[in-house]
Interface confidence: low
């Protein structure tokens, strides 16, 4: 906290600027009016402050708001962004997307912050569900984003907003997470033709059912090795070796490296010994 | 990493001259603002002068306007910082410092930002009268 002292003479701030630079702490505070800043954010961030003047900035801002920012200081933070906390943010109400861009910019290159987990959180909470320009928005910064979140908060992304999803979007996903995307994606796809709409569905596959692996095994997918050992265990047990040959294509030699890994293992020891050698490949039941 | 070492203080009477210079390693990215800062013996830390790298735009604290000159060699990577007319109430120690950062990508949205992150040890310089 720094303390209140009046301004020297002839160092009353009338705009935000470079001389403000080597304005100490204490003049800071005395000398820049809080609602000149607000409405002079944007200039903030073109000026070499300290990190201990920011603090000050920050102060005369929370005194002048303090139930919040209004979103017209908050798109123009800048670096300031940075010294906020999370229970700071939770009294914000964001709304607009370039608001949202405008700070995730400030934090791109590190790590996910609890700041900007709480942006994000505020953000997709006050849109009511996770759109697709906010999704593309989001993964684009952070391409973990989509499995850092609970199969509930899944279920409000509408099947509409999975065509923003990248297969690298999905790498750390887990089963139960994949159980709520995959119908999404399912119906998002519904309407591509065969090869191009297992292109679209590959990486979502996890999450799909034995019904739906039988039918891709019809349409000559040729799926590779590591999509099929990602694959739920209880959907690919019911497959018969014929539809795995189908649905792998040439991949099926593939097999025989994954025969000890899960859901490989368990499917061979589900099928007669005689299918199995269909294959020539060796593996045993 | 970013390291910056400043050399060049010393001891001098009021008037005299000194020259402090900061060694500066670690970038991969060359835009920001480098600067001078001081800290008398129980006073706060304030800044004297700083440069943008940029353009070589140069701001100075009132105080020492005119007495002292900021100025960069590029190509070896030093901030130089000329101070003349000395007074006693310039005494302190001399940071050197930088919101230059190591990682290239990561300043790039606004790099005349002026996180000074980065901080020599310091330089002692005493003016006596």
């Known amino acids: 906290e720094v303390e209140k002292t009046a301004c020297p003479s002839g160092k009353k701030a009338r705009e935000i600027d470079e001389s403000l630079i080597f304005y100490k702490k204490w003049e800071l505070e005395a000398c820049v009016d809080a609602a000149l800043l607000a409405t002079q954010m944007d200039r903030v961030n073109a000026i070499p402050f300290t990190y201990e003047q920011l603090d000050v900035l920050k102060h005369k801002l929370d005194e002048l708001y303090p139930q919040g920012y209004p979103e017209s200081v908050i798109q123009h933070l800048g670096y300031l962004f940075l010294k906020m906390s999370p229970e700071d943010i939770r009294k914000w109400n964001v709304t607009s997307l370039e608001t949202l861009k405008a700070l995730l910019e400030v934090n791109k290159g590190h790590e996910m912050s609890p700041q900007v987990a709480t942006l994000i959180d505020r953000f997709v909470k006050g849109r009511g569900q996770l759109d697709k320009d906010t999704l593309d928005t989001l993964t684009a910064f952070y391409p973990g984003y989509l499995c850092s979140l609970s199969p509930e908060e899944l279920s409000s992304v509408p099947p509409s907003s999975i065509w923003a999803v990248r297969p690298q979007d999905l790498d750390t996903c887990d089963p139960r997470q994949l159980d709520v995307l995959y119908p999404k994606a399912r119906l998002a796809f519904q309407n591509m033709n065969g090869s191009e709409y297992f292109v679209k569905i590959q990486s979502f596959l996890g999450g799909a059912p034995t019904e739906d692996l039988k039918a891709l095994s019809q349409q000559n997918v040729s799926m590779d090795l590591a999509t099929f050992m990602k694959l739920r265990t209880d959907a690919v047990l019911p497959l018969t070796v014929a539809e795995v040959q189908k649905l792998l294509g040439p991949h099926v030699e593939g097999l025989k490296a994954e025969e000890r890994h899960r859901p490989v293992r368990d499917w061979i020891l589900r099928q007669r010994q005689d299918d199995l050698d269909t294959l020539g490949l060796g593996l045993q039941g | 990493q970013v390291k910056l070492v400043e050399s060049g203080g010393g001891s001098v009477q009021a008037g005299g001259s000194l020259r402090l210079s900061c060694a500066a390693s670690g970038y991969t990215y060359s835009y920001g603002y480098m600067g001078w800062f001081r800290q008398a013996p129980g006073k706060e830390r304030e800044g004297v002068a700083k440069i943008y790298n940029g353009d070589g735009s140069t701001y100075y604290a009132d105080s020492v306007k005119g007495r002292f000159t900021i100025s960069q060699d590029r190509r070896n990577n030093t901030l130089y910082l000329q101070m003349n007319s000395l007074a006693p109430e310039d005494t302190g120690m001399y940071y050197c410092?930088?919101?230059?950062?190591?990682?290239?990508?990561?300043?790039?949205?606004?790099?005349?930002?002026?996180?000074?992150?980065?901080w020599g040890q310091g330089t002692q310089v005493t003016v006596s009268s």
């Open positions: 410092a930088t919101n230059r950062l190591p990682n290239s990508d990561v300043d790039l949205v606004l790099p005349r930002f002026g996180r000074f992150g980065y």
